[in-house]
């Protein structure tokens, strides 16, 4: 017998929903002398599968259809000259979180 | 005003290091049968927070990198086949210390 | 486990040029700075270049400034060390060295690769 | 540039016994952000050198409680207060404060 119950969960589970991904602060503000700490933090991103774009779509993708910016307190850690003493403070980062998403097509047939 | 100097001591501390942990011998060893004096013993396990692994990495954990037995001098008790009493030994017990830490991922997402 | 494997050494003559390689694993490379020690013959320590953990910043003591260039490649995990106008007072054993950020301090270090300048 | 002046040149010590380094360094080695970047570094024979104490008294992790790190200013001090055999070879201390970072001569421990 199947659990309908549970089968839905897992729908909801793989289908295209923000969820929480890692995000490494350097690669998303492109800082690369910079050092953060944590250096990743946990954002909600679209994520999982599209079942169903139009009947022609090639390609259907998960993307964001709601983005907000939200602030996150961070200790940034700089080189200063010479090879000691980096330079630290505390620093409010804005990272994007994805609060609704949608399946849309990226890539439609010919036909 | 926030010191840099004990938040930066306060990440080394949280961030993912090997650290002391009590661990009981009887667990450790799985000997139900057998009591151990001291019961616990101090051993050095990975412990802490990992900021990164992979950009699509869902759960990064701890894990050790580099592990080495110590051995232990405890005292063991035993219940005597047959008879009343208990059989004390002195004994030396092979307890995993964790010498390197490094942050893993085990769960990567679809993305 | 955290490895630094240096290559590249060489007998070069006065005056030559030589590039050094340090192969880093076990850790995520582009999050550290790195840098370049040399032990000289007399066993004396002398730091030769540290690099940021994104390849921008630089520093270099008067002694090789102008002559030896540090960089880096991320995607390789790999530190380099290009030295020009070698002179016999550079004959070492050259180290890299990780740059700890939260500790500040160089961490781990090479087993290191011999350089000797002699015509 | 900072002189770093290590003593004794050569320390021979009984395994067991408290093994005290001293560095000096010809100013001071505070850093204009008000930490002390003063390292000790042990090499073995064969060895690269590992790094046993940071910012004058912070063990480095893995490095046994019987080595400790003191001292300010321009006077620091290595202290092993048991020498086991594993602990022999040459001691460096470093100063990171100032450009160019330098380090000491070395102290060779060797045993008695």
């Known amino acids: 017998v199947v659990d309908l119950n549970l089968l839905t969960e897992e729908v909801r589970l793989y289908s295209c929903t923000p969820r929480n991904f890692s995000v490494s602060i350097r690669e998303e503000l492109k800082r690369t002398d910079t050092i953060f700490w944590p250096g990743c933090l946990l954002v909600k991103r679209c994520g999982g599968n599209c079942a169903c774009c139009l009947h022609n779509c090639n390609e259907c993708q998960c993307v964001p259809s709601k983005v907000t910016k939200k602030y996150h307190e961070v200790l940034q850690l700089r080189p200063k000259t010479g090879v000691r003493g980096l330079h630290k403070s505390l620093t409010d980062v804005a990272l994007e979180h994805h609060e609704e998403c949608d399946c849309v097509c990226r890539g439609s047939t010919g036909g | 005003v926030v010191d840099l100097n004990l938040l930066t001591e306060e990440v080394r501390l949280y961030s993912c290091t090997p650290r002391n942990f009590s661990v009981s011998i009887r667990e450790e060893l799985k000997r139900t049968d057998t009591i151990f004096w001291p019961g616990c013993l101090l051993v050095k396990r990975c412990g802490g927070n990992c900021a990164c692994c992979l950009h699509n990495c869902n759960e990064c954990q701890c894990v050790p990198s580099k592990v080495t037995k110590k051995y232990h001098e405890v005292l063991q008790l035993r219940p005597k086949t047959g008879v009343r009493g208990l059989h004390k030994s002195l004994t030396d017990v092979a307890l995993e210390h964790h010498e390197e830490c490094d942050c893993v991922c085990r769960g990567s997402t679809g993305g | 486990e955290v490895q630094l494997v240096e290559s590249g050494g060489d007998l070069v003559k006065p005056g030559g040029s030589l590039k050094l390689s340090c192969a880093a694993s076990?850790?995520?490379?582009?999050?550290?700075?790195m840098s370049w020690v040399r032990q000289t013959p007399d066993k004396r320590l002398e730091w030769v270049a540290t690099i940021g953990s994104g390849g921008h910043y630089t520093y270099y003591p008067d002694s090789v400034k102008g002559r030896f260039t540090i960089s880096r490649d991320s995607a390789k995990s790999t530190l380099y060390l290009q030295m020009s106008s070698l002179k016999s007072e550079d004959t070492a054993i050259y180290y890299c060295?990780?740059?700890?950020?939260?500790?500040?301090?160089?961490?781990?270090w090479g087993q290191g690769t011999t350089l000797t300048v002699s015509s | 540039d900072v002189l770093m002046t290590q003593t004794p040149l050569s320390l021979p010590v009984s395994l067991g016994d408290q093994a005290s380094i001293s560095c000096r360094s010809n100013q001071s080695i505070v850093h204009s952000n008000g930490d002390t970047y003063l390292e000790w570094y042990l090499q073995k024979p064969g060895q690269s050198p590992k790094l046993l104490i940071y910012?004058?008294?912070n063990r480095f992790s893995g490095v046994p409680d019987r080595f400790s790190g003191s001292g300010s200013g321009t006077d620091f001090t290595l202290k092993i207060s048991r020498v086991e055999a594993e602990d022999l070879g040459v001691y460096y201390c470093f100063q990171g404060s100032h450009v160019p970072p330098t380090f000491g001569g070395g102290t060779k421990l060797e045993i008695k």
């Open positions: 060295a990780r740059q700890a950020p939260l500790w500040d301090c160089s961490d781990y």
């Open positions: 910012k004058v008294s």
């Open positions: 076990g850790f995520t490379f582009s999050n550290y700075g």
